[in-house]
């Protein structure tokens, strides 16, 4: 057992069918010696008497919040959560498999340039007494400061019969270094209850892995004479980090019919423009990655050829 | 929301089996862990079993341990209570119940409550 926070403990179950369960011991939190008792939630119910009470924890239905009282005044409160071990694996029912980029991803996370600012998100199908709670480090035998928000519900999805919630949290490392070289990865930890279940998800990353940079910005299209060729232009994003000659970005162009079964052409360039043919109906596309070091591609920036 | 309707209740002989199903519909069932509870007349509602989301855990009370079984289908979004051996002691109308607490045999972890399917057992 082991306390979350004031007056909320978490027990460690490892559970099986018989199983024996945790011996807890609670004690009343209290100078008063004598005439104590105690309940279990809003049951007037006694289940002891003294200044401890010892109980069996072997599932949810013995958590809970315990208080002690002493002729009708309430004299402590110990809230007793469950975190269930089975087969030798701590449960994630709270959170759901994002299964990107592989099986067991319950948190992704996303750094627009390498300011040591990034966003972790996660979902869940449950919609109510649920809370979060998310701390972060960089690296964890020494760690370094990072500081995380709270965390926010950030969308909610219809999927089929389903609604699918979306939470999402900001974190920044509070002594970032953009141009270093990353030794140490960044922890993010969520603590995540649902009514009476404890359940904890841990993701580790480096900034550079987990970089997206943001579209492009300011497209434009200028036709040349005489030509059905088109010179596209852009921006680095207004989030990128600066300055551009160091932290650079490449661009692929993308030439896509109205079809989605049309031949797309596709031209890549460091440069912020590029020479490309406008069929009629088709749209120009540009997206961004960090040019020297392979993490996501940006969302695509587009506008229609006519 | 979920809702759950039950069936396969009916008259017995001590001694015999009956199966009981209860199908799921509305939100996703494989989310939800399923149990079994029942009520005798002018009693409280008394546990029964349990099952986790996935199909692979169950719990028993002890009265019904060695007795009962119960399973589920996700494909079918239902949850079945195999009662063999019965008494006259399990008379009662058996609910079905889904929450996201496994194990729990306290009725207030779970969420949603079907209406009851009578179970008589005549020695």
């Known amino acids: 057992i082991w306390e979350l926070k004031k007056d909320v403990y978490v027990v460690e179950l490892d559970w099986y069918p018989d199983a024996p369960g945790e011996m807890v011991v609670l004690t009343c939190d209290t100078p008063e010696e004598d005439g104590i008792t105690w309940t279990l939630d809003q049951s007037s119910e006694v289940l002891g008497s003294g200044k401890t009470l010892t109980i069996q924890v072997k599932e949810f239905g013995d958590a809970g919040q315990y208080t002690c009282h002493k002729g009708g005044e309430v004299l402590s409160h110990s809230l007793l959560l469950l975190h269930k071990k089975e087969d030798g694996i701590w449960s994630t029912d709270i959170l759901k498999d994002q299964k990107e980029p592989k099986n067991k991803t319950f948190l992704r996370c996303e750094a627009k340039n390498y300011s040591g600012r990034f966003t972790c998100w996660w979902l869940t199908t449950i919609s109510t007494d649920l809370t979060f709670s998310v701390k972060s480090s960089r690296g964890s035998s020494d760690p370094q400061g990072v500081t995380c928000g709270a965390a926010t519900l950030s969308a909610e999805r219809v999927r089929g019969d389903n609604k699918e919630y979306e939470y999402s949290v900001e974190c920044q490392e509070d002594s970032a270094c953009p141009a270093a070289e990353e030794s140490l990865p960044i922890e993010v930890m969520v603590d995540a209850v649902h009514k009476l279940k404890y359940e904890n998800y841990t993701s580790s990353f480096f900034i550079r892995d987990i970089i997206k940079p943001d579209p492009p910005k300011n497209l434009q299209l200028k036709p040349l004479k005489n030509s059905r060729q088109v010179e596209v232009s852009w921006e680095y994003p207004d989030t990128w980090s600066t300055p551009h000659s160091y932290f650079s970005l490449t661009f692929c162009v993308q030439v896509q019919g109205k079809s989605k079964r049309e031949k797309k052409d596709r031209v890549f360039t460091d440069k912020t423009s590029a020479t490309v043919i406008c069929r009629k109906n088709a749209s120009i596309s540009v997206r961004a990655q960090d040019r020297y070091y392979s993490s996501s591609w940006s969302e695509w920036a587009s506008v229609p050829c006519s | 929301e979920v809702q759950l309707v039950e069936s396969g209740g009916g008259v017995v002989q001590a001694g015999e089996s009956l199966r009981l199903s209860c199908a799921a519909s509305g939100r996703i069932f494989s989310d939800y862990e399923m149990g079994w509870f029942r009520q005798a007349p002018g009693t409280e509602r008394e546990f029964v079993a349990a099952?986790?989301?996935?199909?692979?855990?169950?719990y028993y009370a002890d009265s019904v341990k060695g007795r009962f079984t119960i399973s589920r289908d996700n494909a079918k979004n239902t949850v079945y209570l195999q009662m063999s051996s019965l008494k006259p002691e399990d008379t009662a109308v058996y609910y079905c119940?889904?929450?996201?607490?496994?194990?729990?045999?306290?009725?207030?972890?779970?969420?949603?409550w079907g209406q009851g399917t009578q179970v008589t057992v005549s020695s």
């Open positions: 119940a889904a929450g996201r607490l496994f194990p729990s045999s306290r009725s207030r972890d779970y969420d949603y």
């Open positions: 099952i986790s989301w996935r199909g692979s855990s169950t």
